[in-house]
């Protein structure tokens, strides 16, 4: 249904959907601060460009679109049904920022006119891929999947001389929203990851995971899981682990590995951590004062959503083009804009590109060290540490199949 928009005559409004238990359990006040900081920057940039317009945000709050579990899986169509009615009963802004939950976004996308752009801090699932008017400012599952396949196939690095074609995936259903969708994508039988692997089994019980660690008959040495080091410790504890096991811990939105005083615990020695390259200016920003390292990315995505809107608004106004058109709604992709923490690149489908970083634990220093980086924009891996001090034999990653390669 066509939505009436507050989006003309020099006055441009952003509708911001604030959901109590969204993709990350971030206090709404922090998100408000991020949005307001973004608005200040946008106003300044427009003024500097000689554009005398007003830009504001209207917040709409939901405290039950998703339930108390703090996840988005129960994010129901009734919440979206309600939001659609509200949208049709009153004028919305030029753009909707939120929702962050995959189920919500997918349903809203089906229910919304394509002339209405949506910017999401989340919506990680594959069901939100390739949506013409949806922009995602946090790495979606597709990007993770492409990294993993690229890394599995790599066999020409000093520390990885074998292509891998197998994996276990640990997924017990208690994951955070980002992890849930990342692992869902890996589990899906019809996906790039599944297509490229010869063997893949999902471990759903703690005991299954624990048994694999020392099982001589295991079908793969590689286990993918998602979460932080504490999550892994709860599961693995101090159990013995076969020396050719490699655990890939996906923990994209966590800066703590890069902090100076962090020492890797002993249980992390068999683990490669996949995370995002950290930002550089957030530590001193006013909006992030109260944010934990794991929450910065979520608030930053809201802020960058505002800056992205400002970027597009500036371009369209300078070209004398109408904002309330399908052209505007479809324009939030295949571009680079000045984000809060540096340039932000969006791919052809409006999904953020980033530098992923694979870390290992140095047996010498007990510190996390960068093994390689991966540029999601060009789907390319760049080795960083050519002679890593691994726990694995000969400082090389083992073959993924037991009984072959360095043991």
């Amino acid at each position: 249904s066509q939505v009436s928009q507050n989006c003309h005559n020099g006055s441009y409004e952003i509708s911001v959907l604030m959901m109590g238990n969204s993709a990350f359990a971030e206090p709404l006040k922090n998100l408000e601060d991020a949005v307001n900081e973004g608005l200040e920057i946008v106003r300044g940039r427009l003024q500097n460009a000689g554009l005398n317009v007003t830009v504001n945000a209207t917040f709409m709050y939901s405290d039950g679109l998703i339930h108390n579990s703090g996840d988005c899986r129960s994010s129901t169509c009734e919440g979206l049904d309600l939001l659609r009615k509200i949208s049709n009963a009153q004028r919305m802004g030029c753009v909707l920022i939120g929702p962050s939950c995959t189920y919500s976004t997918f349903q809203m996308y089906l229910d919304t006119e394509l002339s209405y752009p949506m910017i999401s801090a989340g919506s990680f699932g594959l069901s939100c891929d390739y949506k013409e008017t949806l922009t995602r400012l946090m790495s979606p599952a597709r990007k993770l999947m492409y990294f993993l396949v690229n890394f599995w196939k790599t066999n020409d690095l000093p520390f990885k001389t074998y292509s891998w074609s197998t994996s276990y995936v640990y997924k017990n259903g208690t994951e955070t929203e980002d992890c849930f969708w990342y692992l869902n994508a890996l589990e899906a039988s019809v996906s790039y990851f599944s297509h490229e692997l010869g063997f893949k089994v999902v471990l759903r019980q703690d005991k299954e995971f624990q048994d694999i660690l020392m099982d001589h008959n295991r079908k793969s040495n590689v286990i993918i899981m998602c979460g932080g080091p504490e999550f892994l410790y709860k599961l693995k504890g101090d159990r013995a682990v076969a020396e050719d096991i490699v655990i890939i811990l996906v923990d994209l939105f966590n800066d703590q590995y890069f902090e100076d005083n962090v020492t890797a615990p002993d249980y992390m020695k068999n683990v490669l951590v996949l995370t995002l390259s950290p930002g550089n200016s957030l530590l001193n920003s006013s909006f992030s004062r109260n944010l934990s390292p794991t929450k910065r990315d979520f608030a930053l995505a809201y802020l960058n959503g505002i800056l992205l809107f400002g970027h597009m608004l500036k371009i369209f106004l300078e070209n004398g083009e109408n904002i309330t058109t399908p052209k505007f709604a479809h324009a939030f992709r295949n571009l680079t804009f000045e984000g809060y923490d540096g340039p932000v690149t969006l791919d052809d489908w409006g999904d953020v590109d980033s530098t992923m970083v694979l870390l290992y634990t140095s047996v010498d220093t007990k510190k996390y060290k960068v093994l390689l980086t991966y540029d999601t924009h060009v789907n390319k891996t760049y080795p960083v540490d050519m002679s890593p001090t691994f726990t694995w034999k000969n400082s090389k990653l083992p073959n993924d199949i037991t009984g072959r390669g360095p043991q």
């Epitope: 009734e78 049904d81 009615k85 009963a89």
Partner: nanobody, 119 residues
Framework: EVQLVESGGGLVQAGGSLRLSCAAS????????MGWFRQAPGKEREFVAA????????FYAHSVKGRFTISRDNAKNTVYLQMNSLKPEDTAVYSC????????????WGQGTQVTVSS
């Protein structure tokens, strides 16, 4: 569509409270999303709060968040708007709206009830 009748409006001093009710006719009330909107003289209609059919999902406008609470009693076919810490700028005609699940709009609207907040 359901018929909607609002009540509970009136004159109240700033800082005071009011509770608006919206009674609905019809046996499928629990499948209807309900909302409260308001319109002050010379201004556009403004969204206030809304609640899903089960009551599990609520939305609030920024201007009323923390002061107003929407709720519903499906056994009584009634939706409520509890308004606390009222301000003069809350003065408006408050209308209740309902829409069947799956329809894109609030298809039913009440006549409205006047709320006046004096300073």
């Amino acid at each position: 569509e359901v018929q909607l009748v609002e009540s509970g409006g009136g004159l109240v001093q700033a800082g005071g409270s009011l509770r608006l009710s919206c009674a609905a006719s019809g046996r499928t009330f629990s499948s209807y999303a309900m909302g409260w909107f308001r319109q002050a003289p010379g201004k556009e209609r403004e969204f206030v709060a809304a609640i899903s059919g089960s009551g599990g999902v609520t939305f609030y406008a920024h201007s009323v968040k923390g002061r107003f609470t929407i709720s519903r009693d499906n056994a009584k076919n009634t939706v409520y708007l509890q308004m606390n810490s009222l301000k003069p700028e809350d003065t408006a005609v408050y209308s209740c709206a309902g829409g069947a699940h799956g329809s894109p709009d609030f298809g039913s609207w009440g006549q409205g009830t006047q709320v006046t907040v004096s300073s």
